[in-house]
Interface confidence: low
Amino acid sequence: FERTRSLQDPCSNCPAGTFCDNNRNQICSPCPPNSFSSAGGQRTCDICRQCKGVFRTRKECSSTSNAECDCTPGFHCLGAGCSMCEQDCKQGQELTKKGCKDCCFGTFNDQKRGICRPWTNCSLDGKSVLVNGTKERDVVCGPSPADLSPGASSVTPPAPAREPGHSPQ
């Protein structure tokens, strides 16, 4: 099938980085500056993505691949392919409708993005609090009195992160 197609369609011979130029007897022409074709047989080249403003270039555009953007310092990527940049907050804060807000008592965030998550409830595992939590750090759970035997583990991993959003319907 491929062989038949290439006999019928000269454009299928045009490699990535070129396009099949209808104005020039369907010969393979290189993509013009600031454009690319990532697959063969293209009849046009795509315009390169430009990383402007809060976006900065992570990977330059080439004749065969689009540019890739990331975000300037103080921002992080959101959206598929970093289509948006969201401002960072400090550790101990979360981004809300009204900007960066400190984590409420009993919650923490150890990153510049994401949400404040509840401290681990040590007592659910029969443990005690070894180190108190802060806005930036989870509590550290220590062994319960019954666990104080040789070889007992003294720290438990933090609980899974609470997912953001509001209460389910």
């Epitope: 959206g79 598929a80 948006m84 981004l95 809300t96 409708k97 993005r113 949400i115 997912e163």
Partner: antibody, heavy 129, light 110 residues
């Protein structure tokens, strides 16, 4: 390439059922809120349902509550919409759309600030006898 | 009946600047951010503006969004024939507790 591809639409009689699927590729599906939006012929956009990245939070429009069920399988990078007790007014093109997982908690879905940045091509559902 | 109100149609000639309005209320536009979507004939909607005035990467700077009180607007400068499409505004409604859209504006380039 970032892509959403819907399937499962078709002609169904009133009272019947359909299951729509939306296959995601080119991005980390499990990081994204997913939404179904529909558009009746010649009409505007209508939000149908949303589901959070790990299915903890699910929302429905009043017009479909109790009849439609949204779900996702992150291992298969696929979103679903099970539609039961279909009515003529459910006739529409159904789009799936993605939104980065929200940052910020409380009674406001901060994620909506970012709109819906990737859309599928849509699948037509026709409910008619 | 859409929660947000848009004019059903708008038009302009190539090179002109056109503005599309989106009117809402205290529970939606005033208290939340507005997104704008472009839907070219026979295709899916595309995000054009988010957070009232931010353009996703790849959207030309001819498109700009703004918000004041309970209204938002989308401005398109240097109008081109390829801008002929339906445009929708969308936001969150705190009272309805769901996303809401305008009814759409059909833009014709004369």
């Amino acid at each position: 390439e970032v892509q959403l591809l819907e399937s499962g639409g078709g002609l169904v009689q009133p009272g019947g059922s359909l299951r729509l699927s939306c296959a995601a590729s080119g991005f980390t599906f499990s990081d994204y809120y997913m939404t179904w939006i529909r558009q009746a012929p010649g009409k505007g956009l209508e939000w149908v349902s949303s589901i959070s990245s790990s299915s903890s939070y699910i929302y429905y429009a009043d017009s479909v509550k109790g009849r439609f069920t949204i779900s996702r399988d992150n291992s298969k990078n696929t979103l679903y919409l099970q539609m039961n007790s279909l009515r003529a007014e459910d006739t529409a093109v159904y789009y799936c759309a993605s939104t980065q997982t929200p940052y910020g908690s409380g009674n406001y879905p901060i994620y909506y600030y970012y709109g819906m940045d990737v859309w599928g091509q849509g699948t037509l559902v026709t409910v008619s006898s | 009946q859409s929660v947000l109100t848009q004019p059903p149609s708008a038009s302009g000639t190539p090179g002109q600047r056109v503005t599309i309005s989106c009117s809402g209320s205290r529970s939606n536009i005033r208290s939340n951010s507005v997104s704008w979507y472009q839907q070219l004939p026979g295709t899916a909607p595309k995000l054009l503006i988010y957070g009232n005035s931010n353009r996703p990467s790849g959207v030309p700077d001819r498109f700009s969004g703004s918000k004041s009180g309970t209204s938002a607007s989308l401005a398109i400068s240097g109008l081109r024939s390829e801008d002929e499409a339906d445009y929708y505004c969308g936001t969150w409604d705190d009272r309805l507790n769901r996303p809401v859209f305008g009814g759409g504006t059909k833009l014709t380039v004369l």
